[in-house]
C-alpha cells in the first residue's frame, strides 16, 4: 500500500466507578482515531488492539476485530473504549480519586494503539504511543485534544 | 452508458486562472475516482492528480501542487480543475478520466473525457 | 517517480500485419499497467488493463503481455482504424507516468 496514516486523536470520555472495599478504581476510557487511506483503492483495517497504562503497568487492554473498510483517498474516525482497573500494588491512587478537596484528579495515562491491515495475506502494522490526562474523580467528556499532556517522554508528530 | 462530459476550449490571458469542469453521468458517481491528465500540443499524457469525489479527498502530482486545485459537487455529479496563475506551459489539453477501484485493487483510466482545450495568450 | 520507456515512437506497417509495442518501466510495476489508444481527434479510450486484460468491446486482435520489465502491446492483424497512438500507463506508484507514446503509421 503507499501508506495508511493512523493518528490518536485522544480521550472522548472517561467514566469512572469505585469498588470501595477493594480501593480499585474503574475507568471506562473511549479514545478517538483518526485512519486515512491514501492509497487510490480500498483498505480493510482487520483489527485495532489497544493498551493503557499507568506508571509503567498495563492496567487495559481492549482489541476490536474487523473494524470496517476505507475508501481510496479517504479517512474514518474510530471510537474505541479500554476498561481499565486501578487496583492492588496501586491502590493507594484510590485516595487520590475520591479526594473531595480537590476539583479535578488528572492522572497522566500512556494510551498505547496499534491498527492491522492486511494487504493480500500481508499484515501491516500502524502504531501511536500517547499520554493523555484522565480525570479519575469524575466522568468526564473531552474535547478533542483537551485531555493531551506534553512533555519531554511524548515525541510530537 | 458512462459519459464524462467536459466543459468546452477556454482562451485565457496569462496570470489569470480558469475552472474546467467534467460532467459524470451513467454510473454513480461517488464510487469511482476522478483523476485529471495533461496533454501539450504534439507532446505525451502527463498525470495532475485524482479526487475521491464521495469524500473530497485529493493527490497530486508534486509538479502540479499549487497550479491545479481538484474539487468535486457530488449533487451535480460534477468534478472541476481549477488552473491558476496560468502561462503559456498552461496551454494544453486537459481530460477528466473515471478510476475504478475494489478492496486493494485498481482498475484506473476507464473512461476518459473528451478533453478541454485550454490556450494561454495575450 | 517511475520511468516507462516506450517503443518505437513512430511505426510503419501494413494492413493485415502483426505488430508489437513495448513499454520499459525502470522499476517494478508488478502488472499495474494499462495500454490506451488515442485518435486523430483527441478521444481517449482504455484497451488494456491489469497488463494482459482486455476491456469491453475491444477487438480480439488486440492483446497485452509481460516479459520482466518490458510490457507489449500487439495487434494481431491490422485493420485500417488501428494506425493512431498508443500509450502506456504505469500505476503501481504514485505519480502515475505514461510512456512516450506510439504513432502507427500506414506503410
Known amino acids: 500500500p503507499r501508506s495508511i496514516d493512523v493518528k490518536y486523536i485522544g480521550v472522548k470520555s472517561a467514566y469512572v466507578s469505585y469498588d470501595v472495599q477493594k480501593r480499585t478504581i474503574y475507568l471506562n476510557i473511549t479514545n478517538t482515531l483518526n485512519i486515512t487511506n491514501n492509497n487510490y483503492y480500498s483498505v480493510e483495517v482487520e483489527n485495532i488492539t489497544a493498551q493503557v497504562q499507568f506508571a509503567k503497568t498495563v492496567i487495559g487492554k481492549a482489541r476490536l476485530n474487523n473494524i470496517t473498510h476505507i475508501g481510496p483517498l479517504d479517512m474514518k474516525q474510530i471510537d474505541y473504549t479500554v476498561p481499565t482497573v486501578i487496583a492492588e500494588e496501586m491502590s493507594y491512587m484510590y485516595d487520590f480519586c475520591t479526594l473531595i478537596s480537590i476539583k479535578v484528579h488528572n492522572i497522566v495515562l500512556m494510551m498505547q494503539v496499534t491498527v492491522t491491515t492486511t494487504y493480500f495475506g500481508h499484515s501491516e502494522q500502524i502504531s501511536q504511543e500517547r499520554y493523555q490526562y484522565v480525570d479519575c474523580g469524575r466522568n468526564t467528556t473531552y474535547q478533542l485534544g483537551q485531555s493531551e499532556y506534553l512533555n519531554v517522554l511524548q515525541p510530537q508528530q | 452508458q458512462v459519459q464524462l462530459q467536459q466543459s468546452g476550449a477556454e482562451l485565457i490571458r496569462p496570470g489569470t486562472s480558469v475552472k474546467v469542469s467534467c460532467k459524470a453521468s451513467g454510473y454513480a458517481f461517488t464510487d469511482y475516482l476522478i483523476e485529471w491528465v495533461k496533454q501539450r500540443p504534439g507532446q505525451g499524457l502527463e498525470w495532475i492528480g485524482v479526487i475521491n469525489p464521495g469524500s473530497g479527498g485529493t493527490n497530486y502530482n508534486e509538479k502540479f501542487k499549487g497550479k491545479a486545485k481538484l474539487t468535486a459537487d457530488k449533487s451535480s455529479s460534477t468534478a472541476y480543475m481549477q488552473l491558476s496563475s496560468l502561462t503559456s506551459e498552461d496551454s494544453a489539453v486537459y481530460f477528466c478520466?473515471?478510476?475504478?477501484?475494489?478492496?486493494?485493487?485498481?482498475?484506473?483510466?476507464?473512461?476518459w473525457g473528451q478533453g478541454t482545450s485550454v490556450t494561454v495568450s495575450s | 517517480d517511475i520511468q516507462m520507456t516506450q517503443s518505437p515512437s513512430s511505426l510503419s506497417a501494413s494492413l493485415g500485419e502483426r505488430v508489437s509495442l513495448t513499454c520499459r518501466a525502470s522499476?517494478?510495476?508488478?502488472?499495474?499497467l494499462n495500454w490506451l489508444q488515442q485518435e486523430p481527434d483527441g478521444t481517449i479510450k482504455r484497451l488494456i488493463y491489469?497488463?494482459?486484460s482486455l476491456d469491453s468491446g475491444v477487438p480480439k486482435r488486440f492483446s497485452g503481455s509481460r516479459s520482466g520489465s518490458d510490457y507489449s502491446l500487439t495487434i494481431s492483424s491490422l485493420e485500417s482504424e488501428d494506425f493512431v497512438d498508443y500509450y502506456c500507463l504505469q500505476y503501481a506508484s504514485s505519480p502515475r507516468t505514461f510512456g512516450g507514446g506510439t504513432k502507427l503509421e500506414i506503410k
Open positions: 522499476q517494478d510495476i508488478g502488472s499495474n
Open positions: 478520466v473515471r478510476s475504478s477501484y475494489g478492496v486493494y485493487v485498481a482498475y484506473p483510466m476507464d473512461y
Open positions: 491489469a497488463t494482459s
